[in-house]
C-alpha cells in the first residue's frame, strides 16, 4: 500500500524558517503533489504549492521555495513573517496525485520538543483516500 | 474533499451523440482549471477538452468540431456533449479538476470514470 511521509523542520540559524519534506513510498509515478497547511487539502487547509514532476511549480505566500528533491519526494522551504511563529503549531500536509490511479495525502507537524535544525521522525498520518 | 462523480457514458453507434456529466461536491476546488480525459484499452491518457477559471477551452486535435465542454458554475458541474462519435472515442472518460502548468490541466481530483464504447 502507498504511504506518504512528511517531515517538518526548523532551520537552525533562522527560527523563522521552516522546511517541509514530503516522500511518497510506493509504485507508480507521480503526477502532481499538493501541499497544504492547517489541514488536508480541502478540508480547511490552504494551499502552499503545486509541483507537477515536468511542468514546474506554483507556489504561494508564505511559501517561499518548493522543489523536487528526487522523483518522489518533494521539498517546501517557509518564510515565517511572524514573531510569534504560527508554523511551529501548524499541520502541513501534502497529497501525492497519480492519476488516474489515486491520490495519498499525510499530514505532519513540528514536534513540540524539537530543537531548531532537527527534523520530525518520517511518521506516515495516512489520510484515507481512494480516487 | 472535493468528490468528482461521472455519468452519461454508455453504448452508442458510431456518428451517435453522449453527453457527459460530472458533479462535483464537498468543498469549493482551489486550483484553476476542469477537464474531461480518457484512456482508451491499452493506451495512455489523453485530454480531451479542459476550461479554466478565465473561461479559456482547449480541445485535443482528435475532437474538435465534434466534443463540446461546458460548466455550470450554479450546479458545480461540468460537461462534455460528444457529437459524431467513432470508434476511436471509446475509452474511459475521466472528470478531472486541477491546476494550469505551462497551459495543460494538470489533475489534481478525479472522478472514478464512465465507460463510452463506440460500436455498431
Known amino acids: 500500500t502507498p504511504e506518504v511521509w512528511v517531515q517538518v523542520q526548523m532551520e537552525a540559524t533562522e527560527l523563522s524558517s521552516f522546511t517541509v519534506h514530503c516522500g511518497f513510498l510506493g509504485p507508480g509515478s507521480i503526477s502532481l503533489v499538493t501541499v497544504s497547511w492547517g489541514g488536508p487539502d480541502g478540508a480547511g487547509g490552504t494551499k502552499l504549492a503545486v509541483l507537477h514532476p515536468e511542468l514546474g511549480t506554483r507556489q504561494w505566500a508564505p511559501a517561499r521555495q518548493a522543489r523536487w528533491e528526487t522523483q518522489s519526494s518533494i521539498s517546501l522551504a517557509l518564510e515565517d513573517s511572524g514573531a510569534s511563529s504560527p508554523f511551529a503549531n501548524t499541520t502541513f500536509c501534502c497529497k501525492f496525485a497519480s492519476f488516474p490511479e489515486g491520490s495519498w495525502e499525510s499530514c505532519g507537524s513540528l514536534p513540540p520538543s524539537s530543537d531548531p535544525g532537527l527534523s520530525a521522525p518520517p511518521t506516515p498520518v495516512p489520510i484515507l483516500r481512494a480516487d | 474533499e472535493v468528490q468528482l462523480v461521472e455519468s452519461g457514458g454508455g453504448l452508442v453507434q458510431p456518428g451517435g451523440s453522449l453527453r457527459l456529466s460530472c458533479a462535483a461536491s464537498g468543498f469549493t476546488f482551489s486550483g484553476d482549471c476542469m477537464g474531461w480525459f480518457r484512456q482508451a484499452p491499452g493506451k495512455g491518457l489523453e485530454g480531451v477538452a479542459t476550461?479554466?477559471?478565465?473561461?479559456?477551452?482547449k480541445y485535443a486535435d482528435s475532437v474538435k468540431g465534434r466534443f463540446t465542454i461546458s460548466r455550470d458554475n450554479a450546479k458545480n458541474s461540468l460537461y462534455l456533449q460528444m457529437n459524431s462519435l467513432r470508434a476511436e472515442d471509446t475509452a474511459v472518460y475521466y472528470c478531472?479538476?486541477?491546476?494550469?502548468?505551462?497551459?495543460?490541466?494538470?489533475?489534481?481530483?478525479w472522478g472514478q470514470g464512465t465507460q463510452v464504447t463506440v460500436s455498431s
Open positions: 478531472a479538476a486541477g491546476w494550469t502548468f505551462g497551459g495543460q490541466c494538470s489533475p489534481a481530483d
Open positions: 476550461i479554466d477559471n478565465a473561461g479559456r477551452i
